[in-house]
Interface confidence: medium
């Protein structure tokens, strides 16, 4: 048999070997594909199958627009002018080339010695699924599960049957000061089909120096608030990846989900006290902010409380 690959949506003509080029012809086409339950014999006279597959005057079989359901086996049996039976056998596979793959959510920079998500490579609309590969400085990157981690996901569109592939790359760069270039390529795995490449991204690797100072910003300034008001405490820390932030009041950890912002709505006297935040960074352990005092008073004009943050007010977090 002969293997045939056809692009989805395009016509495909399969010739019936040995068949006379014009009637009278003795021939029979039968097919076993995703459209048929078992072998289906096509009539040269035509019929309801004409829109899907029809026999041409020269005995060839025409599929006007191949689809995934046309994958399968096609056989023709013909009797030539000398009365000898000739058989043709085709194994048809279809393919669809996806759009150019893209790296989405790319990192802006990498930090040495810690896991960094480089980005997610996405390819949409392929058939068969194909594969995504990552390249570092032009060389194929082999995931080792430690310094190089790849998380893959393949989804099939329920209506079109085409595939969307996602591949998320995480790396642990060994040293800072380098500028690696990452790219991703999609391959269908078909002969004579070149891989499709993303645009490369070049990233700077920096050393994971200790996080710069941790700052606790309070709004309203001075930490003095009237009953029923709202206090916003913001733990500002410039570190990558962003650390987990926990909160402490009067020396005891507060029972909160990690968050860089602590909101105290509708404050009452029970909220008075000394607050600080603790940022836990994977490679540097916990770092505690200087404390701020919160005071609840009927008149908010007593000036900054001792130990509170004065000038800074509420900054913005990236």
């Amino acid at each position: 048999g002969q293997n045939i690959t056809a692009r989805i949506g395009e016509p495909l003509v399969l010739s019936c070997k040995g068949a006379p080029k014009k009637p009278p012809q003795q021939l029979e086409w039968k097919l076993n594909t995703g459209r048929t339950e078992a072998w289906k014999v096509l009539s040269p006279q035509g019929g309801p199958w004409d829109s899907v597959a029809r026999i041409l005057p020269n005995g060839s079989l025409l599929l006007p627009a191949t689809g995934i359901v046309d994958e399968g086996t096609f056989r023709c049996r013909a009797t030539n002018r000398r009365g000898k039976e000739v058989k043709s056998n085709y194994r048809v596979r279809v393919y669809q080339i996806p759009g150019k793959p893209e790296i989405v959510d790319p990192a802006s920079e990498l930090t040495a010695s810690v896991p960094n998500k480089v980005g997610t490579c996405v390819s949409e609309g392929s058939y068969p699924a194909g594969t995504l590969s990552w390249h570092l400085d032009g060389k194929l990157l082999i995931p080792d599960g430690k310094e190089t981690l790849v998380k893959e996901e393949t989804r099939r569109h329920p209506e079109t049957g085409l595939f969307t592939l996602r591949s998320e790359l995480t790396v642990i760069p060994t040293q800072g000061g380098t500028h690696p270039t990452f790219s991703c390529s999609f391959s269908l795995g078909l002969p004579r089909r070149r891989p499709l490449n993303t645009a490369p991204i070049q990233l700077r690797v920096r050393e994971p120096g200790p996080p710069e100072g941790i700052q606790l910003l309070v709004e309203p300034e001075g930490g003095i608030v009237a009953p029923g008001g709202t206090v916003t405490l913001t733990c500002a820390i410039s570190a990558q990846p962003p650390p987990q932030v926990h909160w402490i009041k009067d020396g005891a950890p507060l029972p909160l989900a990690p968050s860089p912002v602590l909101l105290l709505p509708e404050v009452g006297h029970e909220d008075e006290g000394t607050y600080s935040c603790v940022a836990t960074h994977p490679s540097h352990g916990p770092q505690e902010s200087p404390p701020v005092s919160i005071r609840v008073t009927e008149t908010g004009d007593e000036g900054p409380a001792e130990g509170s943050v004065g000038e800074s007010g509420l900054g913005t977090l990236a």
Partner: antibody, heavy 117, light 109 residues
Framework: QVQLQQSGAELVRPGTSVKVSCKAS????????IDWVNQRPGQGLEWIGV????????NYNEKFTGKATLTADKSSSTAYMQLSSLTSDDSAVYFC??????????WGQGTSVTVSS | QAVVTQESALTTSPGETVTLTCRSS?????????ANWVQEKPDHLFTGLIG???NRAPGVPARFSGSLIGDKAALTITGAQTEDEAIYFC?????????FGGGTKLTVL
């Protein structure tokens, strides 16, 4: 007034997942935490986890790590809890509760989840 | 995991003062356990009463108060009323999770 409106009762098959919702109204959704708690038939209360709708930060009871996933949609003021790989042990009434730092004040009416084949 | 223990049932009369307690298997209950008290009425109707050991939740009547008594957290109802008949749960915070007690069934006769 403050209200936490939970989604209706669910009857689900073992091995599947279920997503329970908790729609908040009457207050600023991102200013308070949302805790999730369950009550198995004839038993006490068990804390599942908490989400900070403002930041998306979560904290789980170790027992429910991998079983429960907490999310929140600020635009609709709704908190969600997804439970996966359900077994009959997961049959319970699930509650959401608003928390202001250290005080669980308002509770939802509960969502009954029954896992049965 | 810590175990939190409450009286299984208590009975009081209208107008009386009643105290429910909450004990921790890990030692004395402190303010760092942020004791919460929650009331359950029929049909899974839960209401938070007290948080942070002694902070009353909004709209909770002043007859409910929270405190630490000895090595336990306590909920005191001063002048109990018939509508206070319910199950009361306490919850204690242990550094990264809450643990609830088994509940106290309070009958007001």
């Amino acid at each position: 007034q403050v209200q936490l409106q939970q989604s209706g009762a669910e009857l689900v098959r073992p091995g599947t997942s279920v997503k329970v919702s908790c729609k908040a109204s009457g207050y600023a959704f991102t200013n308070y935490l949302i805790d999730w708690v369950n009550q198995r038939p004839g038993q006490g209360l068990e804390w599942i986890g908490v989400i900070n709708p403002g930041s998306g930060g979560t904290n789980y009871n170790e027992k429910f790590t991998g079983k429960a996933t907490l999310t929140a949609d600020k635009s609709s003021s709704t908190a969600y809890m997804q439970l996966s790989s359900l077994t009959s042990d997961d049959s319970a009434v699930y509650f959401c509760a608003r928390r202001r730092v250290d005080t669980m004040d308002y509770w939802g009416q509960g969502t009954s989840v029954t896992v049965s084949s | 995991q810590a175990v939190v223990t409450q009286e299984s049932a208590l009975t009081t009369s209208p107008g009386e003062t009643v105290t429910l307690t909450c004990r921790s298997s890990t030692g004395a209950v402190t303010t760092s356990n942020y004791a919460n008290w929650v009331q359950e009425k029929p049909d899974h109707l839960f209401t938070g009463l007290i948080g942070g050991t002694n902070n009353r939740a909004p709209g909770v009547p002043a007859r409910f108060s929270g405190s630490l008594i000895g090595d336990k957290a306590a909920l005191t109802i001063t002048g109990a009323q018939t509508e206070d008949e319910a199950i009361y749960f306490c919850a204690l915070w242990y550094s990264n999770h809450w643990v609830f007690g088994g509940g106290t069934k309070l009958t007001v006769l």
